[in-house]
């Protein structure tokens, strides 16, 4: 007996071939001997089966001795043995219909779990293997679970169902809802305008929810809510904003915040959370602000940074075009009695400059100038 695998919702063609290459009488029946369809001359006739409105054949193939049964919009319960009667012969075809669905929404928050459920006909014993967009393979029986979804899990999951050495492939599009970056760091000189951007790693037609940015300043003992906002159909509206600092927010996506001035008291870490409508849980993005200040007080030239810096970052003071006078893995460096000229304060990581502030030291009889 021939075995054919079908997918729920799909269309399947069950073939039946006669030795004579011409249109002759044929009938398709199910295992209960109920007629599905057949022909009377060149007319298509249908029986009283439950497939009635979903069963069809191709008249143009009859003249070639082919008498297919085409079943549209397959259901799991269409799984059955179908019998084609032609030329006093019976051809049996076993149809097994499978369905694979994500038993939650296919739009999931980063860190959530994905469960895929296989619907299969009674008596079948299929195995399932799924391949994620990043090439990770998972195997299972009736259900497959993936915990802690990551951004790279967004895309088409390809699942292969194996039964009777035959296979059928399902493709399921999964969207992992997350920010493009889990964390970002902004380096600014004191007084500069600060731009924070929170691009999303997904696109959906309508995006509605609400969000908040909590800020933990390095100098503060507790965190504080800097801004709360609403998102309606990708339009951003500010609900509440602190007076200090007075943040500004862009009205369109990607989420965009502007801090008018980088000041040492603002240096620290923030956590932007976004709660999406009809979703449990929230999206998070951490943002860090490092602020640099270079000053000269009497005979002391000082460079300081505030905010979350890694211990491997190097802070240096150097006279332009000369070797560094001082270079330390600390948050403040200074030079006593600096010689006149343009001094550079550099914050660098393995030789790559992250932040630079210049200060002009004038000969001792005049006051310093900051460009």
């Amino acid at each position: 007996k021939k075995v054919v695998l079908g997918k729920k919702g799909d269309t399947v063609e069950l073939t039946c071939t006669a030795s004579q290459k011409k249109s002759i009488q044929f009938h398709w029946k199910n295992s209960n001997q109920i007629k599905i369809l057949g022909n009377q001359g060149s007319f298509l006739t249908k029986g009283p089966s439950k497939l009635n409105d979903r069963a069809d054949s191709r008249r143009s193939l009859w003249d070639q001795g082919n008498f297919p049964l085409i079943i549209k919009n397959l259901k799991i319960e269409d799984s059955d043995t179908y019998i084609c009667e032609v030329e006093d012969q019976k051809e049996e075809v076993q149809l097994l219909v499978f369905g694979l669905t994500a038993n939650s929404d296919t739009h999931l928050l980063q860190g959530q779990s994905l469960t895929l459920t296989l619907e299969s006909p009674p008596g079948s014993s299929p195995s399932v293997q799924c391949r994620s967009p990043r090439g990770k393979n998972i195997q299972g029986g009736k259900t497959l679970s993936v915990s802690q979804l990551e951004l790279q899990d967004s895309g088409t999951w390809t699942c292969t169902v194996l039964q009777n050495q035959k296979k059928v492939e399902f493709k399921i599009d999964i969207v992992v809802l997350a920010f493009q970056k889990a964390s970002s760091i902004v380096y600014k000189k004191e007084g500069e305008q600060v731009e924070f951007s929170f691009p999303l790693a997904f696109t959906v037609e309508k995006l509605t929810g609400s969000g908040e940015l909590w800020w933990q300043a390095e100098r503060a003992s507790s965190s504080k809510s800097w801004i709360t906002f609403d998102l309606k159909n990708k339009e951003v509206s500010v609900k509440r904003v602190t007076q200090d600092p007075k943040l500004q927010m862009g009205k369109k996506l990607p989420l965009h915040l502007t801090l008018p001035q980088a000041l040492p008291q603002y240096a620290g870490s923030g956590n932007l959370t976004l709660a999406l409508e009809a979703k449990t849980g929230k999206l998070h993005q951490e943002v860090n602000l490092v602020v640099m200040r270079a000053t000269q007080l009497q005979k002391n030239l000082t460079c300081e940074v505030w905010g979350p810096t890694s211990p491997k970052l190097m802070l240096s003071l150097k006279l332009e075009n000369k070797e560094a006078k001082v270079s330390k893995r600390e948050k403040a460096v200074w030079v006593l009695n600096p010689e006149a000229g343009m001094w550079q304060c550099l914050l660098s990581d393995s030789g790559q400059v992250l932040l630079e502030s210049n200060i002009k030291v004038l000969p001792t009889w005049s006051t310093p100038v900051q460009p």
Epitope: G6, K7, G9, D10, T11, V12, E13, G41, S42, F43, L44, D56, R58, R59, S60, D63, I70, I71, K72
Partner: antibody, heavy 115, light 107 residues
Framework: QVQLQQWGAGLLKPSETLSLTCAVY????????WSWIRQSPGKGLEWIGE???????NYNPSLKSRVTISVDTSKNQFSLKLSSVTAADTAVYYC?????????WGQGTLVTVSS | DIQMTQSPSSVSASVGDRVTITCRAS??????LAWYQQKPGKAPKLLIY???SFQSGVPSRFSGSGSGTDFTLTISSLQTEDFATYYC?????????FGQGTRLEIK
């Protein structure tokens, strides 16, 4: 809802090979036949040929010697190649889904053959 | 090949009119006939299949009848959106063939 999207070169010189591809989005790719039809002012609507998921083909005898229809099931796409084109092959070419009737059509591609 | 002949090749009518288009096959095709509507610059759209069955979404003012060699498409009460070209197609045998079309114009 099934959608058919087609593309390919629109301007050819005589004796060149016409090449068009049609992608099927949504709906079932299996169980159906996938056809190419052309429409020219002189000949009206003319069925070129068809293919199914298994690669089984049927061609219009009037064009059979010049036509090749192929399928790529991994991409839900099928393609038409028509060799040795002449000005008589200038037409709008459509891809379509069929069991007995053409119930879904592509947007059409105007192919002009001119020296 | 089965030849499909439509008549008339064009017809002028007014909104609200009843219009009948006929299609004749050069040999018997049982009920293996479909009707399509085509508007300028667009692909044909299936209206009627198996001679008299409605494709989903097609208004009930369209109806089809016939069997064997003679078939008709009737529009009971013309609407402005019905002014288009109509084609018949046989699915009885390869190669599938179409009628030459009937252009329905506003009077």
């Amino acid at each position: 809802q099934v959608q058919l999207q087609q593309w390919g070169a629109g301007l050819l010189k005589p004796s060149e090979t016409l090449s068009l591809t049609c992608a099927v989005y949504g709906g079932s790719f299996s169980g159906y036949y996938w056809s190419w039809i052309r429409q020219s002012p002189g000949k009206g609507l003319e069925w070129i040929g068809e293919i199914n998921q298994s690669g089984s083909t049927n061609y219009n005898p009037s064009l059979k010697s010049r036509v090749t229809i192929s399928v790529d099931t991994s991409k839900n796409q099928f393609s038409l190649k028509l060799s040795s084109v002449t000005a008589a092959d200038t037409a709008v070419y459509y891809c379509a889904r069929v069991i007995n009737w053409f119930d879904s059509w592509g947007q059409g591609t105007l192919v002009t053959v001119s020296s | 090949d089965i030849q499909m002949t439509q008549s008339p090749s064009s017809v002028s009518a007014s909104v609200g009119d009843r219009v009948t288009i006929t299609c004749r096959a050069s040999q018997g095709i049982s009920s293996w006939l479909a009707w399509y509507q085509q508007k300028p610059g667009k692909a044909p759209k299936l209206l009627i299949y198996a001679a008299s069955s409605f494709q989903s979404g097609v208004p009930s003012r369209f109806s089809g009848s016939g069997s064997g060699t003679d078939f008709t498409l009737t529009i009971s009460s013309l609407q402005t959106e019905d002014f288009a070209t109509y084609y018949c197609q046989q699915a009885n045998s390869f190669p599938y063939t179409f009628g030459q079309g009937t252009r329905l114009e506003i009077k």
